[in-house]
């Protein structure tokens, strides 16, 4: 069985989000992929790849870069210079038609907060890359890590309902801590 779990990524303004979405090679290698933000009940397509996809041929739309690796079945998404208003729920989709998109796994809940009162613009080029989750719980490990080096997920009771045309997906969160390297 496949679990649909939402990952929560927390960033400071100016940092860069880098995530990936995997897909079935045999089905979608030549399909267009898109990165969308859920706004109310309707998703908003922010960027989409060309068709047919070409290896290592990035598509840039403003602060968003998509790079499809059809040989590997992976789409890389990069969002630079994050702003508070970028906060929200995002997902990768196989873009077939504006009203007909197949949602890929691992929806992303992005939370962007104002940077700490440091040197203006000091975090502009920094990247937070979610690394991995320790096997211990957030409660036990939390105090050892300070923002922005930790990402904690919402409590297990919370469920986000994502509505996409013709489908409804329940995404259940898991409580954990994710360590991240912070690049300046």
């Amino acid at each position: 069985t496949t679990e649909l779990t939402e990952e929560k990524y927390e960033y400071k303004e100016g940092q860069t989000l880098e995530v990936k979405c995997d897909y079935a090679l045999e089905k979608y290698a030549n399909s267009r992929k898109a990165w969308q933000k859920m706004e109310g009940k309707m998703p908003k397509i922010l960027a989409k790849t060309e068709r047919p996809s070409e290896n290592s041929h990035p598509v840039q739309v403003g602060r968003i870069t998509l790079e499809d690796y059809p040989d590997h079945g992976l789409l890389q998404v990069r969002m630079t210079n994050l702003q508070v208003e970028d906060s929200g729920l995002y997902q990768c989709v196989i873009y077939q038609h504006p009203k007909e998109s197949h949602v890929l796994f691992n929806p992303i809940c992005l939370v962007v907060t104002k940077g700490s009162s440091g040197t203006p613009g000091s975090s502009e080029n920094s990247t937070q890359n979610v690394y991995r989750t320790p096997s211990t719980t957030a409660k036990a490990l939390g105090p050892r890590y300070t923002s922005p080096r930790t990402v904690t997920q919402a409590p297990p009771e919370s469920t986000v309902v994502v509505s996409t045309p013709g489908s409804e997906i329940n995404l259940t969160n898991v409580t954990d801590i994710i360590r991240v390297p912070v690049f300046n």
Epitope: K20, G73, R78, Y131
Partner: antibody, heavy 122, light 107 residues
């Protein structure tokens, strides 16, 4: 504790196939990618490909495409890597390694299996 | 594919010496670089990820620096247990590629 345990050494003939297993324990199996890396005797490390145990999707490096198959059994938290049409130059130690969480573009392999020696000889 | 060139391929140093290994990428890889240690007959061990973030439990004598195409891995004071081969690995673009390795020995 978090660990990956691989199946034992294999000796096989050219043209045959080998299937190596990698059992994960101590963490949420479906949240992290599993990667396969091989190392010929006295040589460096070579990435073969990845698998997302949750979606079941996988991908491999061009040179292995068509010869490598990655599968998983979530009920026993095990990933399998099968390499077919074996040649003598496939003789190597094959490692499974845990990558980052599946949604992250972060490919650091923090947990490794002990390795499985595969010898291809006629 | 991105080529990772490590140098030197081997080195010999005394206990307490400062050891430096370099890794050069054939194109800009941002900070997308990891360092591993592999002892004979064992699986590799992650030491540094994201160019300079030390993995939990790894001694502070190990450090990493650099960005773009040029990276450095340093052992500030070589210990007998550091005898191993060290590898860099890039993850900026697929396929993931490793450097050829640097074998560190004690004089």
């Amino acid at each position: 504790q978090v660990q990956l345990v691989q199946s034992g050494a294999e000796v096989t003939k050219p043209g045959a196939s080998v299937k190596v297993s990698c059992k994960a324990s101590g963490y949420t199996f479906t949240r992290y990618d599993i990667n396969w890396v091989r190392q010929a005797t006295g040589q460096g490390l070579e990435w073969m490909g990845w698998m997302n145990p949750n979606s079941g999707n996988s991908g491999s490096v061009q040179k292995f495409r068509g010869r490598v198959t990655m599968t998983r059994d979530t009920s026993i938290t095990t990933v399998y890597m099968e390499l077919s049409s074996l040649r003598s130059d496939d003789t190597a130690v094959y490692y499974c390694a845990r990558g980052g969480i599946s949604s992250s573009w972060h490919w650091a392999f923090d947990i490794w299996g002990q390795g499985t020696m595969v010898t291809v000889s006629s | 594919d991105i080529q990772m060139t490590q140098s030197p391929s081997s080195l010999s140093a005394s206990v307490g010496d400062r050891v430096t290994i370099t890794c050069q990428a054939s194109q800009d890889i941002n900070n997308h670089l990891n360092w591993y240690q592999q002892k004979p007959g064992k699986a590799p061990k992650l030491l540094i990820y994201g160019a300079y973030t030390l993995e939990t439990g790894v001694p502070s004598r190990f450090s990493g620096s650099g960005s773009g195409t040029d990276f450095t891995f340093t052992i500030s004071s070589l210990q007998p247990e550091d005898i191993a081969t060290y590898y860099c690995q890039q993850y900026d673009k697929l396929p993931l590629t490793f450097g050829g390795g640097t074998k560190v020995e004690i004089k």
